[in-house]
């Protein structure tokens, strides 16, 4: 829920505003609507169409620490158990990263679906 | 699989507040959107507001905002509803719900709360 | 907020017949909308999610449609414990909402 404090000679301080929902699919242009004691409004907003944005703040996780090196693999693991998902999101209950062992590289995280449809 | 066991309800008078429990077991209650609905007698369902265990995030219907107040207490996996300055149309079964859009939700088995003097 | 209209509010049927329960959105709400059953003194119960989507435990009779603002729950072949009221209910935008019901009832 978000809040916003509005300076304009109406009677209203205190607007809540709604979630950012799609005019068609599930991202990309859209509407979010504001209340403020009987007065509503609807103002144009964006959910992005991204990877990162399904999986990094539609479901978040608390992560157990990194497992031992598989040497098979040259890959380490860890675990994460879901903290909190966007009302909508279906967002598997656990989810499982690997990262290579080599601390020198940076390279981006790997991750099974944190998102799935039933 | 989640279970809900609600408590607290009963016969109130006017102007006086109550708090309803809503205690969970089971899978993880503090991952799961806790919703509250209310269902008049012989009437319809009716959303209350919702809260977030992990950081208590709140969403309430602008129709109870002043009426309403959700909270939880992790250490207890409960959540709360608290309802003031109680009137006769509140009158109604409360429910709590644990929702998750994967799996679906659980309800809990409902409180009447009777508002008469 | 967005209105939810039920349609039928009664819907007479005899157990075998094929039932269909229609929820109108006052305006798109995508594909999040869902079903639930009630019957008396009971908690509601969730029958689909998100339109079309089944639930563990729930019978494969039913069925959802959707979405958009026109969706359909359709019970293909009507038992004697179907008997009961119906609700549609929207996650699309705050607050939730629910429709009014149908009231399924024997013929």
């Known amino acids: 829920k978000k809040k916003e404090k509005v300076k304009k000679g109406s009677e209203c301080s205190e607007w809540t505003w709604g979630p950012c929902t799609p005019s068609s699919k599930d991202c990309g242009m859209g509407f979010r609507e504001g209340t403020c004691g009987a007065q509503t409004q609807r103002v144009h907003c964006k959910v992005p169409c991204n990877w990162k944005k399904e999986f990094g703040a539609d479901c978040k996780y608390k992560f157990e620490s990194w497992g031992a090196c598989d040497g098979s693999t040259g890959t380490k693991a860890r675990q994460g158990t879901l903290k909190k998902a966007r009302y909508n999101a279906q967002c598997q209950e656990t989810i499982r990263v690997t990262k290579p062992c080599t601390s020198k590289t940076k390279s981006k995280t790997k991750a099974k679906k944190g998102k799935g449809k039933d | 699989q989640v279970q809900l066991v609600q408590s607290g309800g009963g016969l109130v008078k006017p102007g006086h507040s109550l708090r309803l429990s809503c205690a969970a077991s089971g899978q993880s209650f503090s991952s799961y959107w806790m919703n509250w609905v209310r269902q008049a007698p012989g009437k319809g369902l009716e959303w209350i507001g919702m809260?977030?265990?992990?950081?208590?995030?709140?969403i309430l219907n602008q129709k109870f905002k002043d009426k309403a107040t959700l909270s939880v207490d992790i250490a207890k996996n409960s959540a709360y509803l608290q309802m003031n300055s109680l009137r006769a149309e509140d009158t109604a079964v409360y429910y709590c719900?644990?929702?998750?859009?994967?799996?679906?939700?659980?309800w809990g088995q409902g409180t009447l709360v009777t508002v008469s003097s | 907020e967005i209105v939810l209209t039920q349609s039928p509010a009664t819907l007479s049927l005899s157990p075998g017949e094929r039932a269909n329960l229609s929820c109108r959105a006052s305006e798109s709400i995508s594909n999040n909308l869902h079903w639930y059953q009630q019957k008396p003194h009971q908690a509601p119960r969730l029958l689909i999610k998100y339109a079309s989507q089944s639930i563990s435990g729930i019978p494969a009779r039913f069925s959802g449609s959707g979405p958009g603002t026109d969706f359909n729950l359709t019970i293909s072949s009507v038992e004697p414990e179907d008997f009961a009221v119906y609700y549609c209910?929207?996650?699309?935008?705050?607050?939730?909402?629910f429709g009014g019901g149908t009231k399924l009832e024997i013929k």
């Open positions: 209910q929207q996650s699309n935008s705050w607050p939730l909402t």
């Open positions: 719900s644990s929702w998750s859009a994967k799996r679906g939700d659980f």
């Open positions: 809260i977030h265990p992990s950081d208590s995030e709140t």
